[in-house]
Interface confidence: low
């Protein structure tokens, strides 16, 4: 493991006076009960709090929210409450914060059964002052911003009605009844699912998928027979209900729902589901579930339109009970995704994809460690790190794995080394190459943040006891060093940075507990001045990522081009700064057949990577739907992966010749119930879906 | 392999109450609307009541409303009817339901609820 | 409250033979209506739903069709196991549920 805190670490000095001057304590006047914290605005200081406190009566629930504002990052707090005429705040729907810079925020209250509608309280000056505004009905959900435009806002009532704001909440319009799901689309438009029925829990599969482009003036019914739809990058997905009525397929727009076309993907059964696990602009990760209740489905990626898809891992994690998956993309290097697999033993086992999802890998543990009881090898194992699987357990994990953009290649996640996720108490590792190369950071499991872009680490032992000490690393994790930050332990209940990493401000959150009271308390360290000068040009050095094989004329080739990054050396302690921005240089490749999907009918043996066809379309003419014509391939098997930009080298050549036939993916017309796919048959049996799941782009 | 197994009925007396249970398998019990339905013996089947997956929405039908509590505990994989005054015409096999579609795809084995003095 | 009127009440066939169940809804309730088999002792056994589909695992000679008001089970050729007591059942709401009195398909 990394040196703890030994003398070969290079220590910062002074830190305990220096963090001691920056460190400022809020006791919260209030009784304990639930406090929620956001950020209002991008480097603005601004952090808005909210207690709740509430006593479930016989008839009704009494409560009292208390609303506090900060404009310095959480060293001060002043009660707001009064802003708010001391109103018990709705906390299931939490504070909608509106998109960017925006500095609106909106707090929907508590009130009375008979009341003919809601009320929101709305705030466009960064919580200075807000304004009380009665809804002409009951909001089922928090408001949804247009990520165009701050001033339009989207709520779906208790009665199933879609209501619109043009003006930040202070007009509502119902533009339409009976919506069962409603989102933001691209340039102002808005997607919806309506029963005309007027039943939204029990008709999945019934459902009219709508969009308007005008806030409700108009509307374009853009497929039928829908059970769900997502949005992920630009393509628009819904699971339609086939000619059968008991399969569902996915069909993909990327035209806003003008046109479908059918998903080369298995079909599913009512009791199974898709998910989008990732999307972007160029390409889509799919999770298609096994038949049956198995815990686990297959993670398909797809080409540039996706329509076409290509096997990327089988016996994918993805719990049909609770919906929790592993799938992780790891933001401080492209390409990187990690996730579990089920085994065929039943253990649970990580993998890593560096290209993604071209090939997946098991993560190498790091060169010191032993094995543990899980390993059947003492000598062979591998690190395996706890996610969303883990935590839904109930195992000691209280934090998923964190990566950041602007912290290139720096990983920090719980796990344990051995053949399987272990049961057993886990450690912190840190990578700081995007997941090649991992080291045991911190003994047993931690809370922890990254602060300015990856200069500073911080952590706090997850402890059921009081807390009153914080770690923080200035070397990525490799050297730790302890402060006290209260002489008094408090509970602790949470990490608090501002979201971005790009802050030098860390809150601790917790409480403290006398025989007569119990009271919120927070603690903000600033590390200003431990990263006490600016970074220059001789603090970084240059890194090129995914780099396996520095004598290789294509090292670092992900994806058709490798990156050289600017790096801060471990040793420099100072300040990337709020401004720092990724300095990297990329560089095209020449393409390898790593570098092309297997086309449509096309798969790539295990440890192989040619494309051969698949034995049952041998000898036969490739038809398949595409842009509601069936299309003629001819092909020898290849496709660019999505955002792969490599030049020359291997040039598979591909043509596509059109037949001229109709082939819809007529399942959204209801009219219209012959549609041929070519998409694998398999599937039974009843209905698991819910969007929106934890970073994961769609859940049925 | 989705399984119901209702339990809780019996004899009682006009005016009395009982508590049925329902425990399910072999699907993911959150994700369904379920249903109870009775049958008075040899007379057709009628509607109860239903309550949704997540337990915030349920409906009864009329000459049990205010009476008869439907209730589910999804960490537990039950669904409940707690009856309340209950009346010599609730007499009946009760059964406990899984929703598909338009109607009930699964149904448990039934447990008979006889109300007499 | 929507009612749902089934006939005949009793259709005395032999096997082989073609049955036609009707069931007719006081108002229209779209295509939400399930049709169940159900023998002596037994749970009922859903057959049809959204009036047209069958359910998992029902052989191809059941069918249905119909919307809006009228609806119909056909049983295209009866075999021995075929003789029970069919009942229709509509969804008009979200979680309001009602039951026809049934058809009772016996042995001529």
């Known amino acids: 493991s990394a040196p703890g805190e030994d003398e070969e670490c290079g220590r910062v000095r002074d830190f305990v006076a220096k963090l001691a001057n920056n460190t400022h304590q809020h006791v919260f006047d209030d009784l304990r009960g639930s406090v929620s914290l956001s950020w209002v605005g991008d480097s603005t200081g601004v952090i808005l709090v909210l207690t709740t406190f509430h006593v479930p009566l016989v008839i009704m629930t009494f409560g009292q929210s208390k609303l506090y504002r900060s404009e310095d990052y959480g060293k001060n707090f002043k009660d707001i409450t009064d802003l708010i005429n001391n109103t018990f705040i709705r906390t299931e729907f939490g504070m909608a914060i509106g998109p960017e810079n925006s500095g609106k925020v909106v707090l929907t209250a508590e009130v009375s059964g008979g009341s003919r509608g809601g009320r929101i309280f709305r705030s466009s000056d960064f919580a200075k002052n807000f304004v009380q505004t009665d809804l002409p009905f009951h909001p089922l959900t928090q408001m949804m911003y247009s990520p165009q435009n701050s001033d339009y806002l989207l709520a779906l009532s208790t009665e199933n009605g879609l209501w619109v704001s043009k003006n930040f909440g202070g007009k509502w319009e119902e533009i339409h009844k009976t919506v069962c799901l409603a989102k933001w689309g691209r340039k102002g438009t808005i997607f919806f699912t309506a029963n005309h029925n007027g039943s939204c829990s029990n008709d999945r599969g019934m459902l009219e998928l709508e969009r308007t482009t005008d806030y409700g003036k108009s509307f374009k019914t853009v497929a039928s027979k829908i059970y769900s739809f997502g949005l992920g990058g630009k393509f628009l997905f819904a699971s339609v209900m086939t000619g059968k009525g008991t399969l569902r397929a996915i069909h993909v727009s990327v035209d806003d729902g003008d046109t479908w076309n059918m998903a080369q993907l298995p079909p599913v059964g009512h009791e199974q589901f898709y998910s989008i696990l990732a999307a972007n602009d160029e390409m889509v990760f799919m999770h298609v579930d096994e038949p049956g209740d198995s815990g686990f489905g297959t993670i398909y990626v797809s080409d540039d339109r996706g329509t076409v898809y290509s096997k990327s891992l089988e016996r994918h994690l993805y719990t049909t009970t609770g919906g929790e998956t592993d799938f992780i993309n790891v933001t401080s290097l492209r390409g990187v995704f990690t996730t579990s697999i089920l085994a065929e033993d039943k253990s649970v086992q990580s993998v890593i994809s560096f290209d993604q999802g071209g090939e997946w890998v098991p993560l190498r543990k790091p060169a010191d460690s032993k094995c543990d009881a899980t390993a059947r090898d003492p000598e062979k194992c591998s690190l395996h790190i706890h996610a969303a699987y883990s935590i839904a357990t109930g195992l000691n994990v209280p934090m998923l794995p964190l990566s950041e953009p602007n912290a290139v290649g720096l990983v920090l996640a719980h796990g344990s080394v051995g053949d399987a996720i272990s049961v057993m108490r886990p450690d912190v590792y840190v990578s700081d190459d995007g997941g090649y190369t991992w080291i045991k950071a911190l003994e047993g499991p931690h809370y922890y943040t990254i602060l300015d872009s990856g200069g500073i680490i911080v952590a706090i032992e997850h402890s059921s006891r009081p807390i009153n000490v914080i770690k923080f690393s200035t070397d990525e994790g490799q050297c730790w060093q302890t402060y006290t930050f209260t002489r008094d332990p408090i509970y602790f209940t949470g990490l608090a940075s501002e979201p971005g990493a790009r802050s030098m401000n860390i809150s601790i959150w917790g409480f403290t507990e006398s025989f007569l009271t119990s009271q919120w308390v927070s603690y903000t360290i600033d590390f200003k001045d431990i990263l006490e000068r600016n970074c220059e040009e001789k603090d970084y050095t240059i890194w090129l990522a995914h780099s396996t094989d520095p004598e290789d004329y294509e090292d670092g080739c992900i994806l058709g081009y490798k990156e050289q990054f600017l790096r801060l050396r471990k040793s420099s302690v100072c300040q990337n700064g709020r401004d720092y921005v990724v300095t990297k240089q990329p560089s095209i490749c020449l393409c390898s057949l790593e570098d092309f999907l297997c086309d449509f009918g096309y798969y790539r043996p295990e440890n192989d990577s040619k494309c051969v066809e698949q034995p049952e379309l041998k000898g036969h003419d490739l038809e398949f739907c595409l842009y509601g014509r069936e299309e003629h391939l001819t092909t020898n098997g290849y496709r660019k992966i999505p955002g792969d930009k490599c030049q020359g080298g291997v040039n598979p050549v591909r043509e596509v010749k059109d037949l001229k036939k109709k082939c819809t993916s007529n399942f959204l017309s209801p009219e219209k119930q012959n549609s041929k796919s070519n998409g694998s048959a398999g599937g039974s049996g009843g209905l698991n879906d819910i969007f929106e799941a934890q970073k994961i782009e769609w859940h049925e | 392999e989705v399984q119901l197994l209702e339990s809780g009925g019996g004899l009682v007396q006009p005016g009395g109450s009982l508590r049925l249970s329902c425990e399910a398998s072999?699907?993911?019990?959150?994700?369904?609307?379920m249903s109870w339905v009775r049958q008075a013996p040899g007379k057709g089947l009628e509607w109860v009541s239903t309550i949704s997956g997540g337990g915030g929405n349920t409906n009864y039908t009329d000459s049990v409303k205010g009476r008869f509590t439907i209730s589910r505990d999804n960490s537990k994989n039950t669904l409940y009817l707690q009856m309340n005054s209950l009346r010599a015409e609730d007499t009946a096999v009760y059964y406990c339901?899984?929703?598909w579609g338009s109607g009930f795809d699964y149904w448990g084995q039934g447990t008979l609820v006889t109300v007499s003095s | 409250e929507i009612v749902l009127t089934q006939s005949p009440a009793t259709l005395s066939l032999s096997p082989g033979e073609r049955a036609t169940l009707s069931c007719r809804a006081s108002q229209s309730v779209s295509s939400y209506l399930a049709w169940y088999q159900q023998k002596p002792g037994q749970a009922p056994r859903l057959l049809i739903y959204?009036?047209?589909n069958r359910a998992t695992g029902i052989p191809a000679r059941f069918s249905g069709s119909g919307s809006g008001t009228d609806f119909t089970l056909t049983i295209s050729s009866l075999e021995p196991e075929d003789f029970a007591v069919y009942y229709c059942?509509?969804?008009?709401?979200?979680?309001?549920?009602?039951f026809g009195p049934g058809t009772k398909v016996d042995i001529k």
């Open positions: 059942q509509q969804r008009s709401n979200w979680l309001i549920f009602t």
């Open positions: 339901a899984k929703n």
């Open positions: 959204d009036a047209s």
């Open positions: 072999g699907f993911t019990f959150r994700s369904y609307v």
